[in-house]
């Protein structure tokens, strides 16, 4: 099939002791090979500080996956989710303030 670019969505969930989990979800993409990783101040986070979901079919002939990491509350602006898919790439910030999600479709 032809390339379908991912929809990328970044969300935050509050956890205890001043830390939050930020999750970057990519959905509705084809083919299944995708790079999704977190950066802090432009530097890639190590694998041992990130958690990935499997790349799974979403039932529409496309795929979905996610990557998450735990960060200090108040440092959201230092983190971005980086995506590469089929020769395209994009960088997605963590939403600030009261906004708890951000999504963007790549073309």
């Amino acid at each position: 099939g032809s390339t379908v670019p991912p929809m990328v969505n970044v969300t935050c969930s509050e956890v205890s002791e001043g830390n939050i989990t930020v999750t970057c979800r990519a959905s509705s993409f084809y083919p299944r090979n995708i790079t999704l990783t977190w950066r802090q101040d432009g530097v890639s986070l190590s694998h041992n500080t990130q958690q990935w979901g499997d790349v799974l079919p979403d039932g529409n002939g496309t795929y979905q996956t996610w990557v998450a990491t735990r960060i200090r509350q108040g440092e959201e602006q230092r983190f971005t989710c980086y995506m590469e898919h089929s020769g395209n790439h994009g960088t997605h910030p963590v939403p600030s303030g009261n906004s708890h999600h951000h999504h963007h479709h790549h073309h």
Partner: antibody, heavy 120, light 107 residues
Amino acid sequence: QVQLKESGPGLVAPSQSLSITCTVSGFSLTGSGVNWVRQPPGQGLEWLGMIWGDGNTDYNSALKSRLSISKDNSKSQVFLKMNSLQTDDTARYYCARGAHYGKRWYFDVWGAGTTVTVSS
Amino acid sequence: DIQMTQTTFSLSASLGDRVTISCSASQGINNYLNWYQQRPDGTVKLLIYYTSTLPSGVPSRFSGSGSGTDYSLTISNLEPEDIASYYCQQYSKLPPTFGGGTKVEIK
């Protein structure tokens, strides 16, 4: 067919800088990372750094102050520049494509390498 | 940095032998381990990624296993073209680091 080919000066004088070019074919630099790895004579492999599809770079912190990685997407070329070379920088320098898929990150295709000797 | 140790610098084996090469990490690496083969002419090839996955084109006589800090590469039936040096590499934590290599020779 994915290929990478390094080209370098061969001989560099101590304290001078090194420039190596990696020319790639069979894939786009906008959608793949390229890594630099070196191997001193008779020793193991050492990761120097990488450049991502968007041009962002990651470096080995032990060498970061001397290293610069850049690229020209239109020419399918990646460039390694290292300053203040010493004799222990003598090595074979490789570029390798990085595949980064979730829990998996590996260097799936390597160039043949180019030998750099630091000597006066 | 995470230190990767291959205690056997070189080993001699007969054609058809089963050969096992060990690699240990200075801390747990969550199966974030790859193996590479370097032929005598310097050519480097990916052999196994994520501890045990074989890329397409790699013969099934190669296999990988391990967990925590201890990992191994096994060649079940040594062939002449397997004469090479083998390197483990972790990517749990940046920078990625390699073992010192194990050279496999024919007895």
